[in-house]
Interface confidence: medium
């Protein structure tokens, strides 16, 4: 029985050219986290494996950094980075938990005027 829950940073916004940390946290379970996959839509960004370490997709290696913790840091953000991101926790013996984060990357001038994107 899967008892855990994933907490995420939720819906976030960031400035074009800046950086953002995508963070998920698995709680309420004693299951062992064996691997975390980070995906953007259907594209695999990174794998963090408990035994075998961090691996960043070559397509993103110049703009994605591992951590902090099991999170992921996106750098040099562009408007094209806007969209859904998923943290997929593989655990034993529970199975798979998935968290969702929506990121909107704002033009600098928009961000400076305090605009924030929200999903009702």
């Amino acid at each position: 029985m899967m008892t855990g829950t994933i907490e995420t940073t939720g819906n976030i916004s960031a400035e074009k050219g800046g950086s953002i940390i995508l963070q998920c946290h698995l709680s309420s379970t004693t299951a062992q986290v064996t691997q975390v996959n980070w995906e953007q839509q259907d594209q695999l960004l990174a794998i963090c494996n408990a035994d075998l370490g961090w691996h960043i997709s070559p397509s993103f290696k110049d703009r994605v950094a591992p951590g902090p913790g099991l999170g992921l840091t996106l750098q040099s953000l562009t408007v094209n980075d806007t969209g859904e991101y998923f943290c997929i926790y593989h655990t034993y013996p529970d199975g798979t938990y998935t968290g969702r984060i929506f990121l909107e990357v704002l033009e600098s001038s928009v961000a400076e005027h305090g605009a924030r994107f929200q999903i009702p």
Epitope: T34, D51, L52, H55, S57, P58, Y92
Partner: nanobody, 115 residues
Framework: EVQLVESGGGLVQPGGSLRLSCAAS????????MGWFRQAPGKERELVAS???????YYADSVKGRFTISADNSKNTAYLQMNSLKPEDTAVYYC?????????WGQGTLVTVSS
């Protein structure tokens, strides 16, 4: 469950080369990480090198520039090319593979570097 079988170990002189192979059979995943660990007598098991399904690689500082990890996805096989071997590389080398859940491990192959 994935079965992993290592081969290619043996006795080699300092400065020599060996190529280890790790063949995986059984349940496999499209998104995986595969790696080589080693354990010398009286020491803890350490990660030597790993490679992901999308081709990124990791190397321990002690083997950078000397060891090269690669994988042939069509054969479900990983390789560790070991050059400029040193006596301190002597250890049992284990292959591991994970598709997300518990990692699968091979039985190990002994590499001895000695003159």
């Amino acid at each position: 469950e994935v079965q992993l079988v290592e081969s290619g170990g043996g006795l080699v002189q300092p400065g020599g080369s060996l190529r280890l192979s790790c063949a995986a059979s059984g349940r496999t995943f499209s998104n995986y990480v595969m790696g080589w660990f080693r354990q010398a007598p009286g020491k803890e098991r350490e990660l030597v090198a790993s490679i992901s399904s999308f081709g990124s690689t990791y190397y321990a500082d002690s083997v950078k520039g000397r060891f090269t990890i690669s994988a042939d996805n069509s054969k479900n096989t990983a390789y560790l090319q070991m050059n400029s071997l040193k006596p301190e590389d002597t250890a049992v080398y284990y292959c591991a593979r994970s598709g997300g859940f518990l990692s699968d491990w091979g039985q190990g192959t002994l590499v001895t570097v000695s003159s």
